[in-house]
């Protein structure tokens, strides 16, 4: 069970209620182990960790990315810009996990524990962030069709793309788990 | 030469007030949150209150919450904590810490100063 | 709040002994720290996230553990090595230390 999931907060006896920035924590850490199980399909069965093709496939993305203006790094670190970018970032990865979905064999229930635990992160996040600007979501119609464009792709490009998202989630939460240790 | 040197300490009564510093030299002070940490004399360490790098976000132990505020300076690079309604165990010496970038380590530690609550 | 039990509480030692200090969490905890501290000064960090060594320290110091077991190794002690040595833990605030460990020359 993700650790943001209701029957965790239950848990053993003598577990105190879970504070807001352990939950974040702990959250993160649960998606990025559930995105190596991922990442390890994905890698076992296509050779699209070694490949050198990225760009091809890249083009057809247009994946969230942490840069400085974002004030998310060490250098030029700002926690309301970042934490505003990071719950920005993540629901744009949202149409990524959904197109994820139907990526996989033997690990389909992972991708679905990826998918829920990155909702109830966001979750998490815009609670931490109740007192910053509004968050603008991204539009429901460019991201069907976005997801509808992906889902037409050839089964190369199906798998890179599949590939670079995992890659490009792992690095997002990554920076987002090391600037948050510091909010 | 990474620093941080606190001030501000001395002798006070029980119900009093006293403001403690710390400036930081040596690093750039904006992208850390810090700590501060006190020790009884004779005893161990107790993590009072953490401040992130802008000051949106404060946390403080139980003991202290509604009477001690943590709060930056970042043009001057110092960090204050604002001790009000003083009681005679929170006599320490009080440390104030730089939390590691990307990490909950407290890793850089000022030499301290002491806190005497008495009448 | 989480507590954190060491022990032994002190040890007597000889130069080149190997010690170890454990830390007993009362539940699971996230991340586990190690701090040296010598009389009159401010703790040292020598241990993060349970087994990287900071900056500086020497690698005869390691630490280990999960879950609610932890413990910090000196692996040959060095005279400036005789001082108390806390755990703290992060799972949440508030941060909680160990009662210390004081490590003496026999």
């Known amino acids: 069970v993700p650790p943001g999931e209701d029957s965790k907060d239950v848990a053993a006896p003598h577990r105190q209620p879970l504070t807001s920035s352990e939950r974040i924590d702990k959250q993160i850490r649960y998606i990025l182990d559930g995105i190596s199980a991922l990442r390890k399909e994905t890698c076992n069965k296509s050779n699209m960790c070694e490949s050198s093709k990225e760009a091809l496939a890249e083009n057809n993305l247009n994946l969230p990315k942490m840069a400085e203006k974002d004030g998310c790094f060490q250098s030029g670190f700002n926690e309301e810009t970042c934490l505003v970018k990071i719950i920005t970032g993540l629901l744009e990865f949202e149409v990524y996990l959904e197109y994820l979905q139907n990526r996989f064999e033997s690990s389909e229930e992972q991708a679905r524990a990826v998918q829920m635990s990155t909702k109830v992160l966001i979750q998490f996040l815009q609670k931490k962030a109740k007192n910053l600007d509004a968050i603008t979501t991204p539009d429901p119609t460019t991201n069907a069709s976005l997801l509808t464009k992906l889902q037409a792709q050839n089964q190369w490009l199906q798998d890179m793309t599949t590939h670079l998202i995992l890659r490009s989630f792992k690095e997002f939460l990554q920076s987002s788990l090391r600037a948050l240790r510091q909010m | 030469e990474v620093q941080l040197v606190e001030s501000g300490g001395g002798l006070v009564q029980p119900g009093g007030s006293l403001r403690l510093s710390c400036a930081a030299s040596g690093f750039t002070f904006s992208p850390f949150a810090m700590s501060w940490v006190r020790q009884a004399p004779g005893k161990g360490l107790e993590w009072v209150a953490k401040i992130s790098p802008g000051g949106s976000w404060t946390y403080y132990s139980d003991t202290v919450t509604g009477r001690f505020t943590f709060s930056l300076d970042t043009s001057k690079s110092t960090a204050y904590l604002q001790m009000n309604s003083l009681r005679a165990e929170d006599t320490a010496v009080y440390y104030c810490?730089?939390?590691?970038?990307?990490?909950?380590?407290?890793?850089?530690w000022g030499q301290g100063t002491l806190v005497t609550v008495s009448s | 709040d989480i507590q954190l039990t060491q022990s032994p509480s002190s040890l007597s030692a000889s130069v080149g002994d190997r010690v170890t200090i454990t830390c007993s969490a009362s539940i699971s905890v996230s991340y586990m720290y190690w701090y040296q501290q010598k009389p009159g000064k401010a703790p040292k960090l020598l241990i993060y996230?349970?087994?990287n060594l900071a900056s500086g320290v020497p690698s005869r110091f390691s630490g280990s553990g999960s879950g609610t077991d932890f413990t910090l190794t000196i692996s040959s002690l060095q005279p400036e090595d005789f001082a108390t040595y806390y755990c703290m833990q992060w799972s949440g605030y508030p941060y909680t230390f160990g009662q210390g460990t004081k490590v003496e020359i026999k």
């Open positions: 810490a730089r939390q590691k970038w990307g990490y909950y380590a407290l890793d850089i």
């Open positions: 996230d349970m087994s």
